[in-house]
């Protein structure tokens, strides 16, 4: 606990103090005060330095002074033998003796008091940074003035901080401008702009005069703008040493003014002023800019659009331009979005074609769609090249955006038909031979395949049975052979309406307009097996010839057989219709006079005993097509026939072009178009 | 008259192969769908496989599946049969034969034997 | 595949006995059948077709029936030089059967 006085004496005194003892006193006074510690009497061995026996006299790590040997007072008023004053409220005393006295020593008397400290000239470091007044136990520190103590009490410092300015355009100066600023002083102006606005700051270098920087290039006084995350100084010395137009690229800044308690100068004065925030004219990749200017400012609204082949995509949703607008912290919105290449995407697939996949589907990329050659052509044109347009699609130079159509290739056969004798006086046959050849099996008949979705027959062939089960793509028609081909499911049956219904069949003598459509459920995959014959031009070009040869296929009654299992087929002449109606009816059902020939029907056969005949009804009469010797068109369809192995009767196809043209459009579907 | 004269056959070790051929004369050759058949001694027969008449479809039994290949030149009127990985069951005499139509065949060679031993 | 099943597998019988042997399919041939003669040493040789239909050039005395799984082969008077193996053959099937054959022998 500090005390304002007290003793201090050695062991044992007044009488002998011991040997080989080390005692220590520690002092304390209040706070504020020094010590003043005097002795009044000193009897302690006398030896160099004190070395052996001593009274040590300590501030924190100062010795202050050892003592030994005897002392008299020189004052004859004062008992004060020696005496010690610091500046402190702490002293520390140590007395210690040897381990002999070759005479006997009495020690020391001493005393100390709590002394006023004169803080303002008693230290090397001046307490106050201007005006020190002291009184007993403490100082206190005052200011010039205009001046005003700062919280740490010591340092005196100009009012000139707190000031905010708002207004777009103004004045700022260090105090007293243009007489020398206040030393000691931290000055901080604050300019709060609008956003969007940016501070400019303009100097010019006359108006600037801070105490130089030291040799280290340290400014002792010095001039900082701060704005946001940038700093703009420190600044010093005499002329503005910085840009004299300061774009700070923020609505906020704060101006921090340092000086120190020497050197100063006349200081500094500047003008700022508010700017719209300026964004930058960015370089947009593919884009133009409207309106187009040389700088752009705060609220400044412009256009990005993309060039042809580049869209902004924002989410799923792909536009061609986007408004940006130039904000107040100099950014532009929108800024994220880009133009980027057009997108294709996968192109869409097409049935009975393919397209590779691209490597690309991003604006001009190109890709090529193909049909399954040779099966399928495409029928729309446009050479099936599709390049990624501005636009997103894949459009093609002729089709535009429409996907191309495969339709199958008629009346190509993947095998020639190397005629010999069958049928009746006909040959064995592969269906690859006759790939449109299709089979009825009740009753039992064929039919040709003229599209994916229809099959040309007889009339006479479907009048009793409207859901016909019929094959495809197989040369044998045993059981097994056709659960292995392709069936095809009937949606519904057209008779020619000049076909006349008779309530006994069996009994009919006009076969005229013996033609009939069967509208598919799905669509026939076309191949090697399977594939449409082509129908008759409407030009005269198809109008047949007596001797012109046609094939003619089906699994009908043979020589040896009521009906064949393997596909049979044989070429045949056109004949003149008066030899069909000379040959005498086989089984006659009525008279031979009843018998119905019409222009509707051709005749052929007569060679070699090569007929068609029961069994073979509906089939194909394929006649080489005269504008394109490739391929095989249906110019005639198995009808009827006086004697098998004789003449026959075949419906003459190219004069119902027409209605089934008509017939197949009117019950065409979406899924075919 | 119609002939059928098959040759190429003989003793072969397992896992070889052989070469049977058929020359067809009498007949237009092109004409006519062409079989083999075989019959091991004192078995049956069994049908081996089928070629129509261009050459384009071929059937072959599953004993012989992957192993043997029936093939025909029309240029030269005749049929052969291609024999590989044999085995000891492929032992017996081997007919070429005509399909007059829808499989029932009409005329027969005389055979050729092919045995398969080691 | 479609087995063909020949009974009896041997018969023996007198010139001018009628003699019959059965085929039977393991499923529905339709008519899809043919009949074979093999004389010893010799190449089969074909007799009936389509079940029924007799090959040209083959004695009338031979004679076929059936249809579906159950077939007959008959020879109405038997002849010393019918001493044979007979064989049914179907083509119902992808790749046509025999039947196991069945040796006629004279008494």
């Known amino acids: 606990e500090p005390t304002m006085y007290g003793e201090i004496l050695s062991p044992n005194y007044p009488q002998a103090y011991p040997s080989e003892v080390e005692k220590s006193w520690d002092i304390e006074v209040p706070e504020g005060y020094g010590i003043h510690l005097y002795f009044t009497h000193l009897d302690i061995e006398l030896s160099e330095n004190c070395a052996y026996d001593s009274v040590q006299i300590i501030s924190g790590d100062t010795e202050e002074g050892r003592l030994c040997g005897q002392r008299s007072s020189n004052n004859p008023h004062s008992p004060i033998v020696e005496e010690f004053q610091v500046p402190y409220n702490k002293l520390q005393v140590i007395f210690k003796s040897d381990f002999s006295n070759e005479e006997r020593f009495t020690g020391f008397a001493a005393y100390y008091v709590a002394t006023d400290i004169n803080e303002c000239t008693d230290f090397v470091d001046v307490p106050c940074s201007h005006f020190c007044n002291n009184f007993i136990g403490g100082y206190f520190c005052s200011c010039p003035p205009e001046y005003f103590l700062h919280d740490d009490m010591k340092n005196c410092g100009v009012n000139c901080s707190g000031d905010v300015f708002t207004a777009l355009i103004g004045e700022i100066a260090s105090p007293n401008y243009p007489k020398p600023y206040p030393e000691n002083s931290r000055c901080e102006y604050q300019i709060r702009l609008e956003k969007g606005f940016q501070v400019v700051v303009t100097l010019r270098r006359e108006d600037f005069d801070v105490e130089a920087a030291d040799s280290a290039g340290n400014c002792l006084d010095s001039l900082v703008f701060v704005a946001g995350d940038r700093q703009f100084g420190p600044y010093c010395g005499h002329g503005f040493p910085g840009p004299l137009n300061i774009e700070t690229k923020s609505n906020a800044l704060d101006i921090i003014f340092q000086t120190d308690l020497t050197g100063q100068k006349k200081g500094w004065k500047l003008r700022y002023h508010g700017d719209p925030m300026p964004c930058p004219k960015e370089d947009t990749p593919n884009s133009v800019w409207e309106p187009a200017k040389a700088k752009y400012v705060f609220r400044d609204v412009v256009q990005i659009t993309c060039l042809d082949g580049f869209e902004v995509v924002e989410g799923r949703v792909g536009a061609t331009s986007f408004y940006s607008t130039c904000q107040s912290n100099g950014k532009w919105s929108n800024s994220k979005l880009k133009c980027q290449p057009v997108d294709c995407g996968i192109p869409e697939s097409i049935e009975n074609g393919k397209v590779e996949d691209p490597e690309s589907t991003l604006f001009g990329s190109v890709i090529r769609y193909t049909c399954e050659e040779p099966y399928y052509y495409m029928e729309n044109g446009g050479g099936g090249e599709y390049h990624c347009a501005g636009n997103g699609s894949w459009v093609n130079e002729v089709l535009g955006p429409e996907l191309p159509k495969c339709v199958p290739v008629c009346g190509v056969p993947r095998e020639p038909f190397e005629e010999k004798q069958r049928i009746i006086g006909g040959s064995d046959a592969d269906i690859k031979n006759f790939p449109w050849q299709v089979f009825f099996d009740n009753p039992w008949a064929g039919g040709a395949l003229i599209n994916e979705y229809w099959v040309l027959t007889a009339a006479h062939v479907v009048e009793g049975n409207r859901e016909p089960t019929m094959y495809v793509g197989s040369t044998s028609v045993q059981t097994s052979r056709l659960a292995k081909s392709k069936m095809l499911t009937p949606e519904h049956v057209f008779i020619h309406p000049g076909w006349k219904l008779l309530e006994v069949p069996e009994g009919r003598t006009n076969f005229d307009n013996d033609i009939a459509l069967v509208r598919l459920k799905d669509p026939v995959k076309m191949g090697p097996t399977v594939s449409p014959i082509c129908l008759p031009g409407t030009s005269s070009d198809y109008n047949l010839m007596d001797g012109d040869l046609g094939l003619i296929s089906g699994w009908g009654r043979t020589e040896k057989r009521d009906r064949a299992v393997r596909l049979k087929a044989a070429r045949l002449p056109v004949a003149p219709l008066r030899k069909c109606k000379e040959v005498k009816v086989e089984k006659p059902t009525a008279d031979a006079e009843a018998y119905v020939f019409t222009p509707n029907m051709i005749c052929a056969g007569g060679e070699k005993g090569m007929d068609s005949c029961k069994g073979d009804s509906g089939g194909a009469f394929a006649v080489q097509d005269p504008n394109d010797k490739t391929k095989f068109y249906a110019a005639g369809l198995v009808s009827w026939g006086p004697q098998c192995g004789t003449y026959g009767l075949y419906t003459r196809v190219k004069n119902y072009v027409d209605w089934i043209m008509k017939t197949m459009q009117e019950n065409s579907t979406p899924r075919e178009d | 008259q119609v002939q059928l004269v098959e040759s190429g056959g003989g003793l072969v070790k397992p896992g070889g192969s052989l070469r049977l051929s058929c020359a067809a004369s009498g007949f237009t050759f092109s004409d006519y769908y062409m079989s083999w058949i075989r019959q091991a001694p004192g078995k049956g027969l069994e049908w081996v496989s089928y070629i129509s008449r261009s050459g384009s479809t071929k059937y072959y039994a599953d004993s012989v599946k992957g192993r043997f290949t029936i093939s025909r030149d029309n240029a030269k009127n005749s049929l052969y049969l291609q024999m590989n990985s044999l085995r000891a069951e492929d032992t017996a005499v081997y007919y070429c034969?005509?399909?007059?139509?829808?499989?029932?065949?009409?005329?027969w060679g005389q055979g050729t034997l092919v045995t398969v031993s080691s | 595949d479609i087995q063909m099943t020949q009974s009896p597998s041997s018969l023996s019988a007198s010139v001018g006995d009628r003699v019959t042997i059965t085929c039977q399919a393991s499923?529905?041939?339709?008519?899809?059948l043919n009949w074979y003669q093999q004389k010893p040493g010799k190449a089969p040789k074909l007799l009936i077709y389509d079940a029924s239909n007799l090959e040209t050039g083959v004695p009338s005395r031979f004679s076929g029936s059936g249809s579906g799984t159950d077939f007959t082969f008959t020879i109405s008077s038997l002849q010393p030089e019918d001493i044979a193996t007979y064989y049914c053959?179907?083509?119902?099937?992808?790749?046509?059967?025999f039947g196991g054959g069945t040796k006629v022998e004279i008494k």
């Open positions: 053959q179907q083509y119902e099937d992808l790749i046509p059967t």
């Open positions: 034969a005509r399909d007059e139509s829808d499989y029932a065949l009409d005329f």
């Open positions: 499923q529905d041939i339709s008519n899809y």
